[in-house]
């Protein structure tokens, strides 16, 4: 086999090297074809190589693996589990990877697996049990601490026809095995909006990321029970004002801080509330940068800036006076 | 492990100046307000002011009792905080405290280090 | 400025036994909802220690000996069963507002 290499380099293995040894246990410093191994690190790196399938002669040592750039396609059941167990992975980067579906119980048998990203892999088909690992009401805690989501949407002819948010939502909350996970990242995903029971039942939050989403309001969105919530990124979004309840729940969380760049801030009557808000709060970043789009008279104004003259609302006329 | 040591105290004439130092661990400093508190010998706690965190300028507040006398910075490349103090008097003896707000800094201090004193005597 | 003032200036209570602290704001410390009002406690040579802030939650670690209460203008810090390692001064702090203020202070001892 290929010898792993010491300190901080990496070894490479030859290709031809991998049919020998597949049917064969790993040896304990084998290095997978086409990957780069460094048992200093305890990483390995299958990058941009085109793989359909992930490695069955991964190194037990592995704590970080990189599977990036890659054909996979299907993340089957037991994707990672071998004999003996990748007791030490906790790093497990599969974006970009082209994955469309991800089978249940994908990432059974990986015990001390903290860190995962799905990120960029058009993922039509995300099985509800992918992450619990099984179909039981409440399922074993999963270790993952942190589930890196970001632009797994996708195009929209391979969608199936169910909710992309619901799909997504039902992985994140089947047998309450993420409970804790402290950081989430959604960006990119096209969301409308966000299931109303989500966050209730991760409240071990410390990060979530919904920016770059469609979301136009959070009012059905409880972010009361997130305590340890220290960052909430909405920025780039389609929120059009955010409402007294929202502003209480986000202004009594202990540590948060929030981002709401590039939302296109409808300041007319409604707005007044967070206007105020907005000029007393500490807990929004860089929210001398907020600026309205709508309507056409105010766009561009900047929210900290307007008074409640300024807010109006159009009056609506009565059927008997309106004219076409 | 947070932690906030200050240092810079020291004797100093009235109408001088002092800088006092707060070198912060064990957190990202960037994401935090940090303040400074002081306390007169056998008196209670009197707030000085705050800097704030990255998102939101780096800006700072100053209470009127120190305003255009004292300077609040940071320096976060080190992880730093200052108080620059000018034109001091001799009601500016105290223990100064530098402490981090919260997350969210509405509530308040969640951290202090162990302090520095300023004597201002002639 | 918010003016708080606590009450009583010291208060000697014996082990055990419970300790009542009280702070009054000039105006209220409320804020969509929540109440911005800390209490910390200072033993003499060391810095404050934070044991509740927004006006009922208890800092991690603070035993739970320990309650705060109140809203609006008026608060209240609770000892439930005085031990001995809680001697020292007690002030309330309120951040609604810039300046953030503090309580002339509360001295416990033991009886």
């Known amino acids: 086999s290929s010898p792993t290499s010491s300190a901080s380099s990496f070894s490479s293995s030859a290709p031809f090297l991998a049919s020998a040894v597949s049917a064969q246990p790993p040896l304990p410093d084998q290095c997978p074809a086409l990957c780069e191994c460094s048992e200093a690190a305890r990483t390995v790196k299958c990058v941009n190589r085109n793989l359909t399938e992930v490695p069955t002669d991964l190194p037990a040592y592995v704590r970080n693996l990189f599977l990036t750039g890659n054909q996979l396609a299907v993340l089957p059941a037991g994707a990672f589990a071998r004999r003996p167990p990748l007791a030490e992975l906790a790093a497990l980067n599969l974006s970009g990877s082209r994955l469309d579906e991800v089978r249940a119980g994908a990432f059974e048998h990986l015990p001390s697996l903290r860190q995962l990203d799905l990120s960029h892999n058009p993922l039509a088909d995300l099985s509800p049990f992918a992450f619990s690992g099984s179909n039981a009401s409440v399922s074993a805690p999963s270790p993952l601490v942190e589930l890196i989501l970001n632009h797994i949407v996708p195009p929209e002819d391979e969608r199936q026809n169910r909710s992309f948010e619901g799909m997504v939502v039902a992985a994140l909350l089947a047998g309450r095995a993420l409970q804790g996970l402290r950081r989430l990242e959604l960006a990119s995903n096209h969301f409308l909006y966000l299931p109303r029971d989500v966050l209730a039942q991760l409240p071990s939050l410390r990060h979530l990321d919904l920016s770059n989403n469609s979301l136009v309001s959070l009012t059905y969105v409880s972010f009361r029970n997130l305590t340890h919530l220290e960052s909430l990124h909405l920025e780039d979004n389609a929120l059009k004002v955010l409402h007294n309840g929202t502003l209480a729940e986000l202004q009594g969380l202990p540590h948060i801080r929030v981002f709401l760049d590039n939302n296109p801030w409808v300041c007319d009557c409604h707005m007044a509330d967070m206007v105020t808000w907005l000029k007393e709060t500490e807990v929004v970043q860089g929210k001398d940068r907020l600026t309205c789009a709508y309507p056409e008279k105010m766009r561009n104004r900047v929210l900290l800036e307007l008074n409640s003259a300024d807010l109006d609302c159009d009056p609506i006329l009565p059927p008997s006076l309106q004219t076409s | 492990e947070v932690q906030l040591v200050e240092s810079g105290g020291g004797l100093v004439q009235p109408g001088g100046s002092l800088r006092l130092s707060c070198a912060a661990s064990?957190?990202?400093?960037?994401?935090?307000?940090m303040s400074w508190v002081r306390q007169a010998p056998g008196k209670g706690l009197e707030w000085v002011g705050f800097?704030?965190?990255?998102?939101?300028?780096?800006?700072?507040e100053n209470s009127a009792s120190v305003k255009g006398r004292f300077t609040i910075s940071r320096d976060n490349s080190k992880s730093s905080l200052y108080l620059q103090m000018n034109s001091l008097k001799t009601e500016d003896t105290a223990v100064y405290y530098c402490a981090r707000y919260r997350g969210n800094p509405h509530y308040a201090m969640d951290y202090w280090g162990q302090g520095t004193l300023v004597t201002v005597s002639s | 400025d918010i003016v708080l003032t606590q009450s009583p200036d010291s208060l000697a209570v014996s082990l055990g036994e419970r300790a009542t602290i009280n702070c009054r704001a000039s105006?209220?410390?409320?804020?969509?909802?929540?109440?911005?009002l800390q209490w910390y406690q200072q033993k003499p040579g060391q810095p404050p220690k934070l044991l509740i802030y927004g006006a009922s939650n208890v800092e991690s670690g603070v035993p739970d000996r320990f309650s705060g209460s109140g809203s609006g203008t008026d608060f209240t810090l609770t000892i439930s069963s005085l031990q001995a390692e809680d001697i020292a001064v007690y002030f309330c702090?309120?951040?609604?507002?810039?300046?953030?203020?503090f309580g002339g202070g509360t001295k416990v001892e033991i009886k």
């Open positions: 702090q309120q951040s609604r507002k810039v300046p953030s203020t």
């Open positions: 064990g957190f990202t400093f960037t994401d935090y307000y």
């Open positions: 800097i704030r965190n990255k998102g939101n300028g780096y800006t700072t």
């Open positions: 105006e209220s410390v409320e804020f969509y909802g929540t109440s911005f």
